[in-house]
């Protein structure tokens, strides 16, 4: 058993049929010695008396808010949550495995640049009685500060018969050094509480590995005189790190016909303009990636050819 | 460069960009054995890193690029020695067409661009790695190449910025 926050305790349980559970001793936070009784949640049933209460915690029915009383007045509360361990593995019932980039990916994080700001998100099918809290640091043995904002419900989607909820959080490294080579990874820890179930999820990454630029902006097409060719140009996204002579991007461009099956020629360039053949009903697209480190490509930015 | 003169920024830019490409094509290494993703994501701790105080940011390069270039040079020599060690030359053998050979040569090439004849002090200072056991090598290769990718990315940014803003 350990204290999650004031008056909230997590009991770690090996979860298997007929498991013995954990013996827990609760102490009433009061100078009083006599006439103390204990109840669980809203039930008025007295579980025991005295300044301490010893219970055997085996299942969710044994968890909840224990209150000590004297003469009808509540003296203190202790909320017991359960953290299940099955076959040596902590439960992951609350969040959905996103399976990208690999199995057992519950938290996904992205950064638009090297400023030390990043966003993490996770998915669940649970809609009520659910709370999250997030902590983050750079490194674990001698952690450096990362400040995270409030968790927000960022999207709701219908997947078949189920509704899926996406939660996200934004974090910022306190003293980021965009030009340096990261030596220690960022650690993100998410605590999830659903009713009386406690779970925790972690992710560890370097900002350089989660970079995903915003799409290039200001796509423009300029037809060339007496030619089927078009001069296309674009700009670095506003959110990308500066100066661009240092934080350079590379681009992938393609012309896509009306039919998705049509062969697309992709061209890679470090420049912010190119000459392409842009047929009527086709569209021109461009995406960006860090020029020197193969992190994610941005989403495509597109304009119609006509 | 060691005496405080300017490097051939454009040449360094080209070679460092080539290094980035090679470092990514060399990893994941397709050797004679599969490598499951093992070990922590934290790279090997004893490799040199370009840190905040090394003056490799745009402002630091403008003020005095020598600190940064010296740091890059040390890192290049360190990785060049690692890629020549039995971690990469021993069993399980790299495939004959592995890009590691080219990567190794390019590290040497860039470090020589930054260190003309007659300046060999860093080379002596950096010890060669002690012999490794074959069973350690796949994971060591994986970690070294991951770490090298990050190192050469910063070096390439430095040379691109230098070529654009500091070239005479």
């Amino acid at each position: 058993i350990w204290e999650l926050k004031k008056d909230v305790y997590v009991v770690e349980l090996d979860w298997y049929p007929d498991a013995p559970g954990e013996m827990v001793v609760l102490t009433c936070d009061t100078p009083e010695e006599d006439g103390i009784t204990w109840t669980l949640d809203q039930s008025g049933e007295v579980l025991g008396s005295g300044k301490t209460l010893t219970i055997q915690v085996k299942e969710f029915g044994d968890a909840g808010q224990y209150t000590c009383h004297k003469g009808g007045e509540a003296l203190s509360h202790s909320l017991l949550l359960l953290h299940k361990k099955e076959d040596g593995i902590w439960s992951t019932d609350v969040l959905k495995d996103q399976k990208e980039p690999k199995n057992k990916t519950f938290l996904r994080c992205e950064a638009k640049n090297y400023s030390g700001r990043f966003t993490c998100w996770w998915l669940t099918t649970i809609s009520t009685d659910l709370t999250f809290s997030v902590k983050s640091s750079r490194g674990s043995s001698n952690p450096q500060g990362v400040t995270c904002g409030a968790v927000t419900l960022s999207a709701e989607r219908v997947r078949g018969d189920n509704k899926e909820y996406e939660y996200s959080v934004e974090c910022q490294e306190d003293s980021a050094c965009p030009a340096a080579e990261e030596r220690l990874p960022i650690e993100v820890m998410v605590d999830a509480i659903h009713k009386l179930k406690y779970e925790n999820y972690t992710s560890s990454f370097f900002i350089r590995d989660i970079i995903k630029p915003d799409p290039p902006k200001n796509l423009q097409l300029k037809p060339l005189k007496n030619s089927r060719q078009v001069e296309v140009s674009w700009e670095y996204p506003d959110t990308w790190s500066t100066p661009h002579s240092y934080f350079s991007l590379t681009f992938c461009i393609q012309v896509q016909g009306k039919s998705k099956r049509e062969k697309k020629d992709r061209i890679f360039t470090d420049k912010t303009s190119a000459t392409v053949i842009c047929r009527k009903n086709a569209s021109f697209s461009v995406q960006a990636q860090d020029r020197y480190y193969s992190s994610s490509w941005s989403e495509w930015a597109s304009v119609p050819c006509s | 460069v060691p005496g405080g003169s300017s490097p051939a920024w454009a040449q360094c830019q080209q070679l460092s960009q080539k290094l980035c490409t090679l470092a990514w094509s060399a990893h994941p290494l397709v050797g004679h054995m599969d490598l499951r993703e093992e070990g922590d994501e934290e790279t090997t701790n004893d490799v040199p890193h370009i840190q905040c105080g090394d003056g490799c940011d745009p402002q630091g390069l403008r003020d005095n690029s020598q600190f940064c270039l010296q740091r890059i040079r040390q890192g290049l020599i360190f990785y060049e020695k690692l890629l020549g060690s039995d971690i990469f030359t021993g069993e399980p053998s790299l495939l004959p067409d592995s890009p590691v050979g080219q990567l190794h040569a390019s590290l040497l090439g860039l470090s020589q661009l930054l260190q003309p004849e007659g300046h060999h002090w860093e080379t002596q200072q950096i010890p060669s790695p002690s012999p490794s056991q074959p069973w350690q090598r796949l994971l060591l290769r994986f970690k070294i190449l991951r770490s090298l990718q990050a190192f050469v990315a910063v070096a390439a940014r430095v040379f691109a910025h230098g070529a654009a803003t500091l070239s005479p």
Epitope: - | H32, M33, K81, G84, S85, D86, T89, G90, E91, P92, S93, L94, G101, S128, P129, S130, P131, Q133, P134, W135
Partner: antibody, heavy 115, light 107 residues
Framework: QVQLVQSGAEVKKPGSSVKVSCKAS????????MHWVRQAPGQGLEWMGY????????NYNEKFKGRVTITADKSTSTAYMELSSLRSEDTAVYYC????????WGQGTTVTVSS | DIQMTQSPSSLSASVGDRVTITCKAS??????LTWYQQKPGKAPKLLIY???SLETGVPSRFSGSGSGTDFTLTISSLQPEDFATYYC?????????FGGGTKVEIK
């Protein structure tokens, strides 16, 4: 073609030393390690040690430590194995071999130790 | 040190027979194992590396299997040129050690 060519047979007196050479050709000498293995008459194979010609790093079998020295000359792509304080039990065929999983071995050098 | 125990030390077989040689490591070596064929007065010839990979130019009747501590070399149909001594060798850690050898003779 890719090959390892070893020096010729040697007859040595007990207490003396022998130095066997192994010349590599057809590949980049510094991209692989070079092992030395011996085989006594009618016996099995025994690893003695290896050298990384790139940095001259060596790794020896404890059994031979202090008696064996493996060196390499990058300029001639040649590896050497020197065994000192020879005794009759050192009579064997000595082989050089590139990385085990590449299948490249020298033809062997017979060393006879006899008074 | 990791010991390699090869069995049998010798066997007699006829052309066309299926022959199996086993090799046991005293500790876990994953798949860091080679198999060699040696004929009198010649250097060992690599047949299998990485426990299961067939060396280029080696006939497909030779195959290797196993991982961890137990390994097998199989010759699916023995040919006249296969009569020789076979050695396994581990390259997981130093000192690299060889099995004692298996002499395959004509019945």
């Amino acid at each position: 073609q890719v090959q390892l060519v070893q020096s010729g047979a040697e007859v040595k007196k007990p207490g003396s030393s022998v130095k066997v050479s192994c010349k590599a050709s057809g590949y980049k000498f510094t991209r692989y390690v070079m092992h030395w293995v011996r085989q006594a008459p009618g016996q099995g194979l025994e690893w003695m040690g290896y050298i990384n010609p790139y940095n001259d790093g060596t790794n020896y079998n404890e059994k031979f430590k202090g008696r064996v020295t493996i060196t390499a000359d990058k300029s001639t792509s040649t590896a050497y194995m020197e065994l000192s304080s020879l005794r009759s039990e050192d009579t064997a065929v000595y082989y050089c071999a590139r990385n085990w999983d590449t299948g490249l071995w020298g033809q062997g050098t017979t060393v006879t130790v006899s008074s | 040190d990791i010991q390699m125990t090869q069995s049998p030390s010798s066997l007699s077989a006829s052309v066309g027979d299926r022959v199996t040689i086993t090799c046991k490591a005293s500790d876990h070596i994953l798949k860091f194992l080679t198999w060699y064929q040696q004929k009198p007065g010649k250097a060992p010839k690599l047949l299998i590396y990485g426990a299961t990979s067939l060396e280029t130019g080696v006939p497909s009747r030779f195959s290797g299997s196993g991982s961890g501590t137990d390994f097998t070399l199989t010759i699916s149909s023995l040919q006249p040129e296969d009569f020789a001594t076979y050695y396994c060798q581990m390259y997981w850690s130093t000192p690299f050690t060889f099995g004692g050898g298996t002499k395959v003779e004509i019945k």
